[in-house]
């Protein structure tokens, strides 16, 4: 039975040029958490942290992402294309997939900030 | 050319180990993971495990963690696999094989050694 | 672990014949599915990484296709050669498991 629930940083912002921190956070569970996947809103993956082999990024963002905080992921480098859906999978044994959310809308103005509060989707 | 090349056929009886090499040549040992695989008579390809030989860090299949044991020797460009307790079903054909991408993620694994015939029985 | 199912287990072609074979995977796996060919007595060759690249060497005729959960091999015009056991693999989450292979045989 899958008793835990994925907390993520929800809806947040950045400013275009600079860099935004993804997490999200598996809570409720005693599973042990193989893998961590980072997808972006076209399927595509980001990043790969295998709890054993450790952290691989796709060639395609070798330059804009980095590794980390924890299980999280660093976008860099921010254009108005980044702007979407993005979502972590985490594998777990021995209950299975969890899979959360995160909308990241990239913005033009000087304004924009960096919300760093944890929803659950 | 790109070349893994394996150690010869082995007897063992049960409860024993047995030690398989696999010594690569013709590219940049450390920067392409090696997985090994196993086949029983008539069966279908079992994935074992794999291993990064450029750091050593392994990942095993659940059904093989506490039996087997992947290690790399940079120096002579050689991974070994070791699997312990063996009992008559495992018996197999094992194979070491070599991702397809360096430095990436291991998806597809394009050159494999010959195989090493390993029979368990008392 | 991510459980991959090859169907069907064996079939019998002739050679021109167009063949398919299917590989489904108990979860998503995005493109990450490869297809070997194996010969017996020999080891596995690989023919198609990330669902449908053809791997370098590999002719034509072997065309992957698929994503998420469902897979699929084709060989468009078989050929003598091609009568061997084919295998799926998943490598998007360890272990990279295999599907239980198709066995193409002469008809």
């Known amino acids: 039975m899958m008793t835990g629930t994925i907390e993520t940083t929800g809806n947040i912002s950045a400013k275009k040029g600079g860099s935004v921190i993804l997490q999200c956070h598996l809570s409720s569970t005693m599973a042990q958490v193989t893998q961590v996947n980072w997808e972006q809103h076209d399927h595509s993956l980001l990043a790969i942290r295998n709890a054993e082999l450790g952290w691989h990024i796709y060639p395609a963002f070798k330059d804009r992402v980095a590794p980390g905080p924890g299980l999280g992921l660093t976008l860099q480098s921010l254009t108005m294309n980044d702007t979407g859906e993005y979502f972590c999978t985490y594998h777990t044994y021995p209950d299975g997939t969890y899979r959360g959310r995160i909308f990241l809308e990239v913005l033009e103005s000087s304004v924009a900030e960096h919300s760093a509060r944890f929803q659950i989707p | 050319q790109v070349q893994l090349v394996q150690s010869g056929a082995e007897v063992k009886k049960p409860g024993a180990s047995v030690k398989v090499s696999c010594k690569a040549s013709?590219?940049?040992?450390?920067?392409?993971?090696m997985g090994w695989v196993r086949q029983a008579p008539g069966q279908g390809l079992e994935w074992m495990g794999i291993?990064?030989?450029?750091?050593?860090?392994?990942s095993y299949a659940r059904k093989f963690q506490g039996r087997v044991t992947m290690t790399r020797d940079t120096s002579t460009s050689t991974v070994y696999m070791e699997l312990s307790s063996l009992r008559s079903e495992d018996t197999a054909v094992y194979y070491c094989?070599?991702?397809?991408?360096?430095?990436?993620?291991?998806?597809?694994?394009?050159?494999w050694g010959q195989g090493t015939t390993v029979t368990v029985s008392s | 672990d991510i459980q991959m199912t090859q169907s069907p287990s064996s079939l019998s072609a002739s050679v021109g014949d167009r063949v398919t074979i299917t590989c489904r995977a108990s979860?998503?796996?995005?493109?990450?599915l490869n297809w070997y060919q194996q010969k017996p007595g020999k080891a596995p060759k690989l023919l198609i990484y990330?669902?449908?690249s053809l791997q370098s060497g590999v002719p034509s005729r072997f065309s992957g296709s698929g994503s998420g959960t469902d897979f699929t091999l084709t060989i468009s015009s078989l050929q003598p050669e091609d009568f061997a056991t084919y295998y799926c693999?998943?490598?998007?989450?360890?272990?990279?498991?295999f599907g239980g292979g198709t066995k193409v045989e002469i008809k």
């Open positions: 979860q998503s796996i995005n493109s990450y």
């Open positions: 990330a669902a449908s």
């Open positions: 291993i990064d030989p450029s750091g050593g860090r392994t």
């Open positions: 693999q998943q490598s998007l989450l360890t272990p990279f498991t």
């Open positions: 094989a070599r991702a397809r991408t360096p430095s990436s993620w291991p998806y597809g694994m394009d050159v």
């Open positions: 013709g590219y940049t040992f450390g920067s392409y993971y």
